[in-house]
Interface confidence: low
Amino acid sequence: MRTEAQVPALQPPEPGLEGAMGHRTLVLPWVLLTLCVTAGTPEVWVQVRMEATELSSFTIRCGFLGSGSISLVTVSWGGPNGAGGTTLAVLHPERGIRQWAPARQARWETQSSISLILEGSGASSPCANTTFCCKFASFPEGSWEACGSLPPSSDPGLSAPPTPAPILRADLAGILGVSGVLLFGCVYLLHLLRRHKHRPAPRLQPSRTSPQAPRARAWAPSQASQAALHVPYATINTSCRPATLDTAHPHGGPSWWASLPTHAAHRPQGPAAWASTPIPARGSFVSVENGLYAQAGERPPHTGPGLTLFPDPRGPRAMEGPLGVR
C-alpha cells in the first residue's frame, strides 16, 4: 500500500568508513525496504442490483479495498458480440463525474466506493445478464478492475453479492515476474541488513539544503509491471453475453492531465461543470518524482523534471458509440 518514506540525506562518509560502496549499499536497502513495505494486494468489489420498482433499472456499486489514493474510477458495460464495450461513467476525485446514457446518476458513496444508477428504458437499457465492470486507478497500487452481473435467477430487488476478486488483465501481466524480482529484493535486503549488522553505519541527518527531503515512492509489487504503470483506460465487456476482457478502450488512458501545468497539484482553472457534483477531496495522483511513468510509454498525470513523455502513437480508433466504442 502507499508509503512515503523520508529518505534522509547522507553525509559524506568519514575516512576509514565504508566509502562509496557503503553509500550504495545503504541507499539500496532504503529503496528495497520501501518496496517491501508497499507490497500488498488491493481488491475491487462490484455489486449489481436490479431495482424492484423498475425491472430494467440497475444499480451498480463498486469499491476499492486498498489504502492508495484513488485517481480515477471507470464503470463500463458490454458491447455486442464482444466487439467492444461502452463506458457508462468516469469519476475523478477532483475533476468531477461524467456519465453517458443509459447512466442516470453516478456518484461517490465514500472516498473509495461509487454507485451508478442505470435508467431502464430505451434501446440502450441493460439486460439481466449484462456484465458491469469497475476499474479503479490508484497510487501506488496501479489499475485494478472487477466485474459483476446479476446471478441468472436473481429476483427483482435482490442483488448479486459483491465480487471482490480482481480480474487479471493484460495490464497486470507482469505481476508475477515483478513480484519475483521484489521477493528476491526483499531477501537481498535481509542479506544486506545482516551484513551490516555489526558494521558502523554513517551518520544520517536531514538535508540542510532543502526544506523537504526527497520522497521515495514505490509501486506495490503486484502492480509494478510496465503496463500497470499506465494511467488506466476504460474497460470493455460484452453485453448480455459472456464477458470478454481482452479489448482495450479505443483510446488508452485519461486525458485531463494534458492540461495540467508542470508540477501542478491542483485542478486547472476551467468551467464550473465539476463543481455541481459532490466529490470527496483527494490528493493528486502521483508525485513528479515517480519516474516509472517514463518506462510505461504513457503520459503521466503531471510531469516533473527530466521525465520523458511518449505520446500514444496509436491515436483513436474510429468511433461510433459513447467514448468512441464501436
Epitope: 434501446a123 488508452g252 486525458s255 461543470a273 483513436p316 474510429a318
Partner: antibody, heavy 129, light 107 residues
C-alpha cells in the same frame, strides 16, 4: 489564440473530388488533445458533421459520407485536409473546419470541456459544371 | 445515428424578453449536449456544452438545462446581438449530430 482558416477552390465540377485544407495557427496540431473536424452547412440548412482527424492520422467519418471522404493531416505544415470524391450538386455547401474538445485522444479519456470551440470562418464550395 | 429535433423552427421575441428554445434527442444522450449560436455569414459559436456549462466568454443570460432526451436553452433577456440561429448538438455518440436550428428573430 488558436485560429483556423479554410482554403480551397470555390467551384468543383460534378464527379470530381473536392479538396479543402484547414490551416491551424496559434497552436500545434501535434500537441494532441483535440479532434480536428470538418463540418458542412448546406445553403439555408443545418450543420452536418463530416469527420475528424487526430494528429496521428487516425480518423472517423460520418457513415453517410464515409465512402467518399478522406481526411488527412500534415503536422509539418500544421494543416489538415478534406477530400470528398464523386461530388454532386448536393455537396454544395459552406465547409467549416473546427477543433473539437470532446475527447483527448493523447491519453484517451473524456475531457471535462466539450464541443467545437474554435471554428474557421467557412469556405463556400459550389458543385456545378 | 441520434436525430436531434429543435422547436420551434422560428421564435419571435422582443428585445429584453425571455426566449426558450427546445431540443429533443431521438434517444438518451445523458447530459452530453451543446448549443451553438450562428449569425448570418459567420461560423457557429459554442455557447453551452455538457448541457448547462457556459463556454468561455458567454454571458450568463444564456443557460442550458435538461437531461436525457429533452433539453432547453434559455436566454433570459434578449439583447440585440442575440438574434441569430441556434443549434443543439449531441456529443454522446458518433457521429456528432446537430438539430436543424431555431431562428430567434425580432418581434
Amino acid at each position: 489564440q488558436v485560429q483556423l482558416q479554410e482554403s480551397g477552390p470555390g467551384l468543383v465540377k460534378p464527379s470530381q473530388t473536392l479538396s479543402l485544407t484547414c490551416t491551424v495557427s496559434g497552436g500545434s496540431i501535434s500537441s494532441g488533445g483535440y479532434y480536428w473536424s470538418w463540418i458542412r452547412q448546406h445553403p439555408g440548412k443545418g450543420l452536418e458533421w463530416i469527420g475528424y482527424i487526430y494528429y496521428s492520422g487516425s480518423t472517423s467519418y460520418n457513415p453517410s459520407l464515409k465512402s467518399r471522404v478522406t481526411i488527412s493531416v500534415d503536422t509539418s505544415k500544421n494543416q489538415f485536409s478534406l477530400k470528398l470524391s464523386s461530388v454532386t450538386a448536393a455537396d454544395t455547401a459552406v465547409y467549416y473546419c473546427a477543433r473539437d474538445l470532446d475527447y483527448d485522444i493523447l491519453t484517451g479519456y473524456p475531457r471535462w470541456d466539450y464541443g467545437m470551440d474554435v471554428w474557421g470562418q467557412g469556405t463556400t464550395v459550389t458543385v456545378s459544371s | 445515428e441520434i436525430v436531434m429535433t429543435q422547436s420551434p423552427a422560428t421564435l419571435s421575441v422582443s428585445p429584453g424578453e425571455r426566449a426558450t428554445l427546445s431540443c429533443r434527442a431521438s434517444q438518451s444522450v445523458s447530459n452530453n449536449l451543446a448549443w451553438y449560436q450562428q449569425k448570418p455569414g459567420q461560423a457557429p459559436r459554442l455557447l453551452i456544452y455538457s448541457e448547462s456549462t457556459r463556454a468561455t466568454g458567454i454571458p450568463d443570460r444564456f443557460s442550458g438545462s435538461g437531461s436525457g432526451t429533452e433539453f432547453t436553452l434559455t436566454i433570459s433577456s434578449l439583447q440585440s446581438e442575440d438574434f441569430a440561429v441556434y443549434y443543439c448538438q449531441q456529443h454522446n455518440n458518433w457521429p456528432r449530430t446537430f438539430g436543424q436550428g431555431t431562428k430567434v428573430e425580432i418581434k
